[in-house]
Protein backbone atom coordinates (compact mmCIF):
# COMPACT_ATOMS: atom_id res chain seq x y z
CA UNK A 1 0.00 0.00 0.00
CA UNK A 2 1.59 3.26 -1.10
CA UNK A 3 0.55 6.70 0.09
CA UNK A 4 -0.38 8.65 -3.06
CA UNK A 5 0.57 12.10 -1.75
CA UNK A 6 2.88 13.50 0.89
CA UNK A 7 0.23 15.93 2.11
CA UNK A 8 -2.96 14.83 3.86
CA UNK A 9 -6.15 15.35 1.86
CA UNK A 10 -7.84 16.65 5.00
CA UNK A 11 -7.28 16.94 8.72
CA UNK A 12 -9.82 16.54 11.47
CA UNK A 13 -9.52 17.44 15.14
CA UNK A 14 -11.58 15.08 17.26
CA UNK A 15 -11.78 13.37 20.59
CA UNK A 16 -11.53 9.61 20.52
CA UNK A 17 -13.67 7.34 22.65
CA UNK A 18 -14.44 3.65 22.77
CA UNK A 19 -17.70 2.11 21.65
CA UNK A 20 -18.66 2.05 25.34
CA UNK A 21 -17.97 5.78 25.69
CA UNK A 22 -14.71 5.58 27.60
CA UNK A 23 -12.26 8.31 26.63
CA UNK A 24 -8.82 7.80 25.17
CA UNK A 25 -6.48 10.09 27.10
CA UNK A 26 -2.80 10.89 26.89
CA UNK A 27 -0.50 11.76 29.79
CA UNK A 28 3.13 12.82 29.85
CA UNK A 29 5.00 10.64 32.36
CA UNK A 30 8.79 10.52 32.74
CA UNK A 31 9.34 12.27 29.40
CA UNK A 32 7.18 9.81 27.49
CA UNK A 33 3.48 9.69 26.79
CA UNK A 34 1.17 7.04 28.19
CA UNK A 35 -2.18 6.19 26.65
CA UNK A 36 -5.17 5.46 28.88
CA UNK A 37 -8.72 4.27 28.36
CA UNK A 38 -10.86 5.69 31.14
CA UNK A 39 -14.18 7.12 32.24
CA UNK A 40 -14.05 10.88 32.48
CA UNK A 41 -15.84 12.82 35.18
CA UNK A 42 -18.77 14.95 34.04
CA UNK A 43 -17.58 18.18 32.36
CA UNK A 44 -13.96 16.96 32.31
CA UNK A 45 -12.35 18.03 29.04
CA UNK A 46 -11.66 15.29 26.51
CA UNK A 47 -8.21 15.04 24.97
CA UNK A 48 -8.16 15.74 21.28
CA UNK A 49 -6.37 14.02 18.45
CA UNK A 50 -5.43 15.41 15.07
CA UNK A 51 -6.43 12.84 12.45
CA UNK A 52 -4.66 13.38 9.15
CA UNK A 53 -6.28 11.57 6.21
CA UNK A 54 -4.09 10.32 3.37
CA UNK A 55 -5.07 8.54 0.19
CA UNK A 56 -3.43 5.21 -0.39
CA UNK A 57 -3.35 2.97 -3.42
CA UNK A 58 -3.99 -0.76 -3.08
CA UNK A 59 -1.02 -2.85 -4.22
CA UNK A 60 -1.71 -3.56 -7.89
CA UNK A 61 -1.68 -7.33 -7.36
CA UNK A 62 -4.44 -7.04 -4.73
CA UNK A 63 -6.98 -5.09 -6.71
CA UNK A 64 -8.36 -4.67 -10.18
CA UNK A 65 -9.44 -1.15 -9.33
CA UNK A 66 -6.70 0.78 -11.12
CA UNK A 67 -6.96 4.45 -10.24
CA UNK A 68 -10.09 3.70 -8.25
CA UNK A 69 -8.45 1.28 -5.82
CA UNK A 70 -8.11 3.81 -3.05
CA UNK A 71 -8.14 3.52 0.72
CA UNK A 72 -8.03 6.15 3.43
CA UNK A 73 -5.03 6.03 5.71
CA UNK A 74 -4.90 8.04 8.90
CA UNK A 75 -2.24 9.19 11.30
CA UNK A 76 -3.24 10.16 14.85
CA UNK A 77 -1.41 12.90 16.73
CA UNK A 78 -2.54 13.93 20.22
CA UNK A 79 0.20 16.54 20.57
CA UNK A 80 2.75 18.22 18.34
CA UNK A 81 5.40 15.89 16.87
CA UNK A 82 3.96 12.78 18.56
CA UNK A 83 2.02 10.11 16.68
CA UNK A 84 0.40 6.80 17.56
CA UNK A 85 2.57 3.93 16.31
CA UNK A 86 1.81 0.24 15.93
CA UNK A 87 4.37 -1.93 17.65
CA UNK A 88 3.55 -5.18 15.91
CA UNK A 89 6.14 -7.23 17.81
CA UNK A 90 4.71 -6.28 21.20
CA UNK A 91 1.09 -6.05 19.94
CA UNK A 92 1.02 -2.60 21.51
CA UNK A 93 0.05 0.93 20.52
CA UNK A 94 2.59 3.55 21.52
CA UNK A 95 3.15 7.28 21.22
CA UNK A 96 6.45 8.19 19.62
CA UNK A 97 8.08 11.41 18.60
CA UNK A 98 8.66 11.32 14.84
CA UNK A 99 9.68 13.57 12.02
CA UNK A 100 8.03 13.59 8.63
CA UNK A 101 7.98 11.55 6.52
CA UNK A 102 6.39 9.35 9.15
CA UNK A 103 7.24 5.65 9.31
CA UNK A 104 4.71 3.09 8.07
CA UNK A 105 3.99 2.12 11.70
CA UNK A 106 2.25 5.50 12.15
CA UNK A 107 -0.31 4.82 9.40
CA UNK A 108 -3.62 3.02 9.86
CA UNK A 109 -6.23 2.04 7.27
CA UNK A 110 -9.53 3.69 8.17
CA UNK A 111 -12.62 1.46 8.30
CA UNK A 112 -16.02 3.04 8.91
CA UNK A 113 -18.86 1.08 10.44
CA UNK A 114 -20.95 4.20 9.92
CA UNK A 115 -20.51 7.92 10.40
CA UNK A 116 -18.29 8.72 13.39
CA UNK A 117 -17.70 5.05 14.21
CA UNK A 118 -14.37 3.81 12.95
CA UNK A 119 -11.69 1.16 13.21
CA UNK A 120 -7.96 1.53 12.59
CA UNK A 121 -6.10 -1.27 10.82
CA UNK A 122 -2.32 -1.37 11.04
CA UNK A 123 -0.69 -0.55 7.71
CA UNK A 124 2.29 -2.74 8.58
CA UNK A 125 0.23 -5.74 9.71
CA UNK A 126 -3.03 -6.17 7.77
CA UNK A 127 -5.81 -7.79 9.80
CA UNK A 128 -4.50 -6.25 13.01
CA UNK A 129 -6.48 -3.35 14.50
CA UNK A 130 -6.14 -0.85 17.33
CA UNK A 131 -8.36 -2.16 20.11
CA UNK A 132 -9.01 -1.97 23.83
CA UNK A 133 -7.51 -4.56 26.13
CA UNK A 134 -7.35 -4.24 29.94
CA UNK A 135 -8.04 -0.49 29.84
CA UNK A 136 -5.19 0.13 27.41
CA UNK A 137 -4.88 0.37 23.67
CA UNK A 138 -3.43 -2.74 22.06
CA UNK A 139 -3.14 -4.34 18.65
CA UNK A 140 -5.81 -6.98 18.15
CA UNK A 141 -5.87 -9.58 15.39
CA UNK A 142 -9.24 -9.77 13.61
CA UNK A 143 -9.75 -13.07 11.83
CA UNK A 144 -12.44 -12.13 9.33
CA UNK A 145 -14.58 -9.20 8.24
CA UNK A 146 -17.46 -10.61 10.30
CA UNK A 147 -15.54 -9.62 13.42
CA UNK A 148 -15.03 -6.02 12.30
CA UNK A 149 -18.17 -5.08 14.24
CA UNK A 150 -16.61 -6.35 17.45
CA UNK A 151 -16.92 -3.58 20.00
CA UNK A 152 -13.35 -3.60 21.27
CA UNK A 153 -11.96 -2.32 17.96
CA UNK A 154 -14.69 0.26 17.35
CA UNK A 155 -14.03 3.90 18.23
CA UNK A 156 -16.17 7.00 18.07
CA UNK A 157 -14.95 10.32 16.74
CA UNK A 158 -16.54 13.45 18.13
CA UNK A 159 -15.89 17.10 17.44
CA UNK A 160 -13.92 19.10 19.94
CA UNK A 161 -14.93 22.72 20.43
CA UNK A 162 -12.82 23.63 23.46
CA UNK A 163 -9.20 24.06 22.48
CA UNK A 164 -6.75 23.65 19.65
CA UNK A 165 -4.08 21.07 18.92
CA UNK A 166 -0.85 22.59 20.23
Amino acid sequence: MSITGISPITEYLASLSTYNDQSITFALEDESYEIYVEDLKKDEKKDKVLLSYYESQHPSNESGDGVDGKMLMVTLSPTKDFWLHANNKEHSVELHKSEKPLPDQAFFVLHNMHSNSVSFESKTDPGVFIGVKDNHLALIKVDSSENLSTENILFKLSETHHHHHH
Partner: antibody, heavy 121, light 106 residues
Protein backbone atom coordinates in the same frame (compact mmCIF):
# COMPACT_ATOMS: atom_id res chain seq x y z
CA UNK B 1 -13.50 0.83 -16.03
CA UNK B 2 -16.04 1.07 -13.22
CA UNK B 3 -19.58 0.20 -14.30
CA UNK B 4 -22.83 0.05 -12.32
CA UNK B 5 -25.95 -1.18 -14.09
CA UNK B 6 -29.33 -0.91 -12.37
CA UNK B 7 -32.34 -3.00 -13.40
CA UNK B 8 -35.76 -3.85 -12.01
CA UNK B 9 -37.59 -0.54 -12.27
CA UNK B 10 -41.04 -0.17 -13.79
CA UNK B 11 -44.66 0.75 -13.17
CA UNK B 12 -46.15 -0.68 -9.99
CA UNK B 13 -49.36 -0.09 -8.04
CA UNK B 14 -49.32 1.44 -4.55
CA UNK B 15 -48.85 -1.18 -1.83
CA UNK B 16 -47.03 -3.58 -4.16
CA UNK B 17 -43.36 -4.61 -4.20
CA UNK B 18 -40.40 -4.26 -6.52
CA UNK B 19 -36.79 -5.44 -6.32
CA UNK B 20 -34.00 -3.40 -7.86
CA UNK B 21 -30.61 -4.88 -8.74
CA UNK B 22 -27.30 -3.22 -9.45
CA UNK B 23 -24.52 -5.25 -11.07
CA UNK B 24 -21.03 -3.84 -10.56
CA UNK B 25 -17.84 -4.39 -12.53
CA UNK B 26 -14.37 -2.86 -12.87
CA UNK B 27 -13.49 -2.81 -9.17
CA UNK B 28 -13.13 -5.13 -6.19
CA UNK B 29 -16.80 -5.07 -5.19
CA UNK B 30 -16.39 -6.70 -1.77
CA UNK B 31 -14.10 -3.87 -0.60
CA UNK B 32 -16.64 -1.08 -1.04
CA UNK B 33 -19.73 0.32 0.62
CA UNK B 34 -22.67 0.57 -1.79
CA UNK B 35 -25.59 2.99 -1.83
CA UNK B 36 -29.01 3.65 -3.30
CA UNK B 37 -29.94 7.28 -4.01
CA UNK B 38 -33.16 8.44 -5.63
CA UNK B 39 -34.37 11.45 -7.56
CA UNK B 40 -38.06 12.25 -7.97
CA UNK B 41 -38.93 13.73 -11.39
CA UNK B 42 -37.63 17.30 -11.61
CA UNK B 43 -36.39 17.22 -8.01
CA UNK B 44 -33.11 16.92 -6.12
CA UNK B 45 -31.14 13.90 -4.94
CA UNK B 46 -32.10 11.94 -1.82
CA UNK B 47 -29.98 9.29 -0.12
CA UNK B 48 -32.09 6.15 0.48
CA UNK B 49 -29.90 3.36 1.85
CA UNK B 50 -26.31 2.20 2.47
CA UNK B 51 -24.64 -1.14 3.04
CA UNK B 52 -21.07 -1.72 4.19
CA UNK B 53 -18.61 -3.89 2.29
CA UNK B 54 -19.41 -7.19 4.06
CA UNK B 55 -23.16 -6.53 4.27
CA UNK B 56 -23.21 -6.56 8.07
CA UNK B 57 -24.27 -2.93 8.49
CA UNK B 58 -27.24 -1.33 6.74
CA UNK B 59 -28.74 2.17 7.00
CA UNK B 60 -32.00 3.68 5.75
CA UNK B 61 -33.75 6.97 5.18
CA UNK B 62 -36.43 7.30 7.89
CA UNK B 63 -39.31 7.34 5.40
CA UNK B 64 -38.31 3.94 3.93
CA UNK B 65 -37.36 2.13 7.17
CA UNK B 66 -39.34 -1.08 7.56
CA UNK B 67 -40.40 -1.04 3.90
CA UNK B 68 -37.09 -1.17 2.00
CA UNK B 69 -34.25 -3.67 2.48
CA UNK B 70 -30.76 -3.29 1.06
CA UNK B 71 -28.62 -6.42 0.59
CA UNK B 72 -25.63 -7.56 -1.40
CA UNK B 73 -24.10 -10.68 -2.91
CA UNK B 74 -20.35 -10.20 -3.07
CA UNK B 75 -19.86 -13.41 -5.05
CA UNK B 76 -22.08 -12.00 -7.80
CA UNK B 77 -20.98 -8.34 -7.52
CA UNK B 78 -24.58 -7.28 -7.00
CA UNK B 79 -26.42 -4.99 -4.60
CA UNK B 80 -30.20 -5.12 -4.22
CA UNK B 81 -33.00 -2.89 -2.98
CA UNK B 82 -36.17 -4.76 -2.04
CA UNK B 83 -39.02 -2.22 -1.94
CA UNK B 84 -42.27 -3.24 -0.25
CA UNK B 85 -45.48 -1.32 0.48
CA UNK B 86 -44.65 1.18 -2.23
CA UNK B 87 -46.19 4.64 -2.11
CA UNK B 88 -46.68 7.29 -4.79
CA UNK B 89 -43.97 9.40 -3.12
CA UNK B 90 -41.44 6.61 -3.85
CA UNK B 91 -41.73 7.44 -7.56
CA UNK B 92 -38.22 8.35 -8.67
CA UNK B 93 -35.16 7.32 -10.65
CA UNK B 94 -33.12 5.07 -8.35
CA UNK B 95 -29.36 5.26 -8.68
CA UNK B 96 -26.82 2.78 -7.38
CA UNK B 97 -23.48 4.27 -6.27
CA UNK B 98 -20.18 2.95 -4.93
CA UNK B 99 -18.08 4.28 -2.10
CA UNK B 100 -15.02 6.34 -2.93
CA UNK B 101 -12.65 4.39 -0.67
CA UNK B 102 -12.31 0.74 0.29
CA UNK B 103 -13.91 0.00 3.69
CA UNK B 104 -15.13 3.57 4.09
CA UNK B 105 -18.58 5.16 4.16
CA UNK B 106 -17.15 8.48 2.98
CA UNK B 107 -18.22 9.83 -0.40
CA UNK B 108 -19.69 8.24 -3.59
CA UNK B 109 -17.25 8.05 -6.48
CA UNK B 110 -19.33 6.45 -9.25
CA UNK B 111 -23.03 6.29 -10.08
CA UNK B 112 -25.05 4.05 -12.36
CA UNK B 113 -27.40 5.46 -14.99
CA UNK B 114 -30.45 4.78 -12.82
CA UNK B 115 -33.70 2.86 -13.14
CA UNK B 116 -37.11 4.56 -13.04
CA UNK B 117 -39.70 3.39 -10.51
CA UNK B 118 -43.23 4.70 -11.02
CA UNK B 119 -45.80 4.01 -8.30
CA UNK B 120 -49.28 4.71 -9.61
CA UNK B 121 -52.71 3.13 -9.76
CA UNK C 1 -30.14 15.18 11.24
CA UNK C 2 -27.92 17.52 9.26
CA UNK C 3 -29.64 19.79 6.72
CA UNK C 4 -27.77 21.14 3.70
CA UNK C 5 -28.84 24.43 2.10
CA UNK C 6 -27.54 25.49 -1.31
CA UNK C 7 -27.68 29.00 -2.73
CA UNK C 8 -28.62 30.35 -5.10
CA UNK C 9 -31.12 27.79 -6.41
CA UNK C 10 -30.61 29.14 -9.95
CA UNK C 11 -27.57 31.02 -11.25
CA UNK C 12 -27.11 32.61 -14.68
CA UNK C 13 -23.59 33.39 -15.83
CA UNK C 14 -21.63 34.02 -19.02
CA UNK C 15 -18.88 31.94 -20.58
CA UNK C 16 -15.56 32.92 -18.99
CA UNK C 17 -17.16 34.13 -15.75
CA UNK C 18 -15.87 33.12 -12.34
CA UNK C 19 -18.79 31.33 -10.68
CA UNK C 20 -19.26 30.65 -6.98
CA UNK C 21 -21.85 28.24 -5.54
CA UNK C 22 -22.58 28.05 -1.83
CA UNK C 23 -23.54 25.22 0.49
CA UNK C 24 -24.36 25.64 4.19
CA UNK C 25 -24.70 22.83 6.73
CA UNK C 26 -26.90 23.01 9.83
CA UNK C 27 -23.98 21.69 11.94
CA UNK C 28 -20.20 21.46 11.64
CA UNK C 29 -19.43 18.72 9.10
CA UNK C 30 -15.64 18.78 9.45
CA UNK C 31 -14.94 19.14 5.71
CA UNK C 32 -16.78 15.85 5.04
CA UNK C 33 -18.38 17.34 1.94
CA UNK C 34 -18.50 16.53 -1.78
CA UNK C 35 -19.78 18.33 -4.85
CA UNK C 36 -21.32 16.52 -7.80
CA UNK C 37 -22.53 17.67 -11.20
CA UNK C 38 -25.65 16.43 -12.95
CA UNK C 39 -26.37 17.27 -16.56
CA UNK C 40 -29.92 16.91 -17.94
CA UNK C 41 -30.79 13.26 -18.52
CA UNK C 42 -27.52 11.99 -17.00
CA UNK C 43 -26.40 10.43 -13.75
CA UNK C 44 -24.56 12.63 -11.24
CA UNK C 45 -20.77 12.77 -11.44
CA UNK C 46 -18.37 13.40 -8.55
CA UNK C 47 -16.34 16.60 -8.93
CA UNK C 48 -14.83 17.40 -5.54
CA UNK C 49 -14.44 15.25 -2.41
CA UNK C 50 -13.44 16.10 1.16
CA UNK C 51 -14.17 19.78 0.44
CA UNK C 52 -11.22 20.57 -1.83
CA UNK C 53 -9.89 17.44 -3.56
CA UNK C 54 -10.44 17.22 -7.31
CA UNK C 55 -11.75 13.87 -8.54
CA UNK C 56 -9.64 12.18 -11.22
CA UNK C 57 -10.45 13.46 -14.71
CA UNK C 58 -12.23 16.64 -13.60
CA UNK C 59 -10.91 19.91 -15.14
CA UNK C 60 -8.82 22.10 -12.83
CA UNK C 61 -11.17 25.07 -13.30
CA UNK C 62 -13.30 23.41 -10.59
CA UNK C 63 -12.21 23.94 -7.00
CA UNK C 64 -13.73 23.63 -3.56
CA UNK C 65 -13.16 25.32 -0.23
CA UNK C 66 -14.70 25.77 3.19
CA UNK C 67 -14.80 24.44 6.72
CA UNK C 68 -17.20 24.11 9.62
CA UNK C 69 -20.65 24.81 8.19
CA UNK C 70 -19.83 26.89 5.09
CA UNK C 71 -18.58 25.49 1.78
CA UNK C 72 -18.03 26.82 -1.73
CA UNK C 73 -17.63 25.39 -5.22
CA UNK C 74 -15.83 27.72 -7.64
CA UNK C 75 -15.59 27.47 -11.42
CA UNK C 76 -12.73 29.79 -12.37
CA UNK C 77 -13.79 30.28 -15.99
CA UNK C 78 -17.24 29.01 -16.95
CA UNK C 79 -17.42 26.80 -20.06
CA UNK C 80 -20.58 25.92 -22.04
CA UNK C 81 -20.27 22.26 -20.96
CA UNK C 82 -20.54 23.32 -17.30
CA UNK C 83 -24.28 23.98 -17.65
CA UNK C 84 -25.75 21.53 -15.15
CA UNK C 85 -27.21 21.25 -11.66
CA UNK C 86 -24.65 21.08 -8.85
CA UNK C 87 -25.31 19.28 -5.58
CA UNK C 88 -23.35 19.35 -2.35
CA UNK C 89 -23.42 16.30 -0.13
CA UNK C 90 -22.29 15.67 3.46
CA UNK C 91 -21.16 12.39 5.03
CA UNK C 92 -19.97 13.55 8.43
CA UNK C 93 -23.13 12.29 10.09
CA UNK C 94 -25.39 10.16 7.96
CA UNK C 95 -25.67 11.16 4.32
CA UNK C 96 -27.49 14.29 3.13
CA UNK C 97 -27.72 16.22 -0.15
CA UNK C 98 -28.33 19.90 -0.64
CA UNK C 99 -31.23 21.00 -2.83
CA UNK C 100 -29.00 21.84 -5.78
CA UNK C 101 -27.98 24.92 -7.77
CA UNK C 102 -29.02 25.04 -11.42
CA UNK C 103 -26.32 26.79 -13.45
CA UNK C 104 -27.46 28.38 -16.70
CA UNK C 105 -25.79 30.40 -19.45
CA UNK C 106 -26.78 34.04 -19.79
Amino acid sequence: EVQLVETGGGLVQPGRSLKLSCVASGFTFSNYWMYWIRQAPGMGLEWVSSINNDGGNTYYLDSVKGRFTISRNNAENTVYLQMNSLRSEDTATYYCAKGHYSYSSYSFSYWGQGTLVTVSS
Amino acid sequence: DIQMTQSPSVLSASVGDRVTLSCKASHNINKHLDWCQQKVGEAPKLLIYFTNNLQTGIPSRFSGSGSGTDYTLTISSLQPEDVATYFCFQYNSGWTFGGGTKLELK
